[in-house]
């Protein structure tokens, strides 16, 4: 039975030029996570692996950092990364957990975090 | 250039165990991630497991209860051992580079791959 | 694990014609997909990653393209050092997994 839930930095904001961290964490379960994939519709932005370090995909390779963690750091953010990105958890032996963070990137500096929330 | 050379005995009994090794030249084995991939007649490529840098190993779980990937740094090599195999063993056995990093899971440099045949 | 599944399974093209192979992955891998050329009594080589970047030294004639679960190997005038099995392979999550492969021949 999968017991865990993701935890993830929810809806947020940031400012068109500027960067922002996308974080998930896995909770509430003793499975071992063995990759980590970070997504964009069906883009593949990167993935950790938990033997194997990060890959991260040549598209993005310009605009994105590994970490902090198991996070994803994107980088000279225009309006057109404005969009749902999400953390596919792979594990054993419980399976594939999905977190979900939406991101508005802002023309003005009024960016402001969201709260966190919970994806079971 | 990566050099990857296997070598082992071609033909192997039933209930036994399969050794190979792959000699590696032109690179340390102590950076990316050294694999073990096969091809039996008339079937596809199935990738049997890894060896990291770092000394962690991850099996395909259809091989998981019979096969160890083991490494000799200082002769900068690595070893497969299969145990209990049948007819349905008998491939061509390749080992291979992968680097996690730029690639992904690609395998960019491959042994020249040696035939193992299965029989009493 | 993911099946990867190829087709056609052989393709007999003329010398300056395009070919195009399709791999269809049995669940959704993003642009985790890799493709190999095995010539005759040679082991693969790796030919595209992340779908549609080309590897060193791959000529331009080859193309790769798709997302999500259709992928395209294109080779847009083939030679006749093109002749061998290509393969598809995902690593969106592991076991890696390879397709069955497509024989490409010359007419």
């Known amino acids: 039975m999968m017991t865990g839930t993701i935890e993830t930095t929810g809806n947020i904001s940031a400012e068109k030029g500027g960067s922002i961290i996308l974080q998930c964490h896995l909770s509430s379960t003793t499975a071992q996570v063995t990759q980590v994939n970070w997504e964009q519709q069906d883009q593949l932005l990167a993935i950790c692996n938990a033997d194997l370090g990060w890959h991260i995909s040549p598209s993005f390779k310009d605009r994105v950092a590994p970490g902090p963690g198991l996070g994803l750091t994107l980088q000279s953010l225009t309006v057109n990364d404005t969009g749902e990105y999400f953390c596919i958890y792979h594990t054993y032996p419980d399976g594939t957990y999905t977190g979900r963070i939406f991101l508005e990137v802002l023309e003005s500096s009024v960016a402001e975090h969201g709260a966190r929330f919970q994806i079971p | 250039e990566v050099q990857l050379q296997e070598s082992g005995p071609g033909l192997v009994k039933p209930s036994e165990t399969l050794s190979l090794t792959c000699a590696v030249s032109g690179y340390s084995i102590t950076s990316d991630s050294w694999n073990w991939i096969r091809q039996p007649p008339g079937k596809k490529l199935e990738w049997m497991g890894y060896i990291s840098y770092s000394g962690n190993t991850y099996y395909n779980p259809s091989l998981k209860s019979r096969i160890t990937i083991s490494r000799d740094t200082s002769k900068n090599q690595f070893s497969l051992k299969l145990s209990s195999v049948t007819a349905a063993d008998t491939a061509v056995y390749y080992c291979?580079?992968?680097?996690?990093?730029?690639?992904?899971?690609?395998?960019?440099?491959w042994g020249q791959g040696t035939t193992v045949t299965v029989s009493s | 694990d993911i099946v990867m599944t190829q087709t056609p399974l052989s393709l007999s093209v003329t010398p300056g014609q395009p070919a195009s192979i399709s791999c269809k992955a049995s669940q959704n891998v993003r642009t985790a997909v890799a493709w190999y050329q095995q010539k005759p009594g040679q082991s693969p080589q790796l030919m595209i990653y992340?779908?549609?970047y080309r590897y060193t030294g791959v000529p331009d004639r080859f193309s790769g393209s798709g997302s999500g679960t259709d992928f395209t190997l294109k080779i847009s005038r083939v030679e006749a050092e093109d002749v061998g099995v290509y393969y598809c392979?995902?690593?969106?999550?592991?076991?890696?997994?390879f397709g069955g492969g497509t024989k490409v021949e010359i007419k």
């Open positions: 392979q995902q690593y969106y999550t592991t076991p890696w997994t």
């Open positions: 291979a580079r992968l680097d996690f990093s730029n690639y992904g899971g690609a395998v960019d440099y």
């Open positions: 992340s779908a549609s």
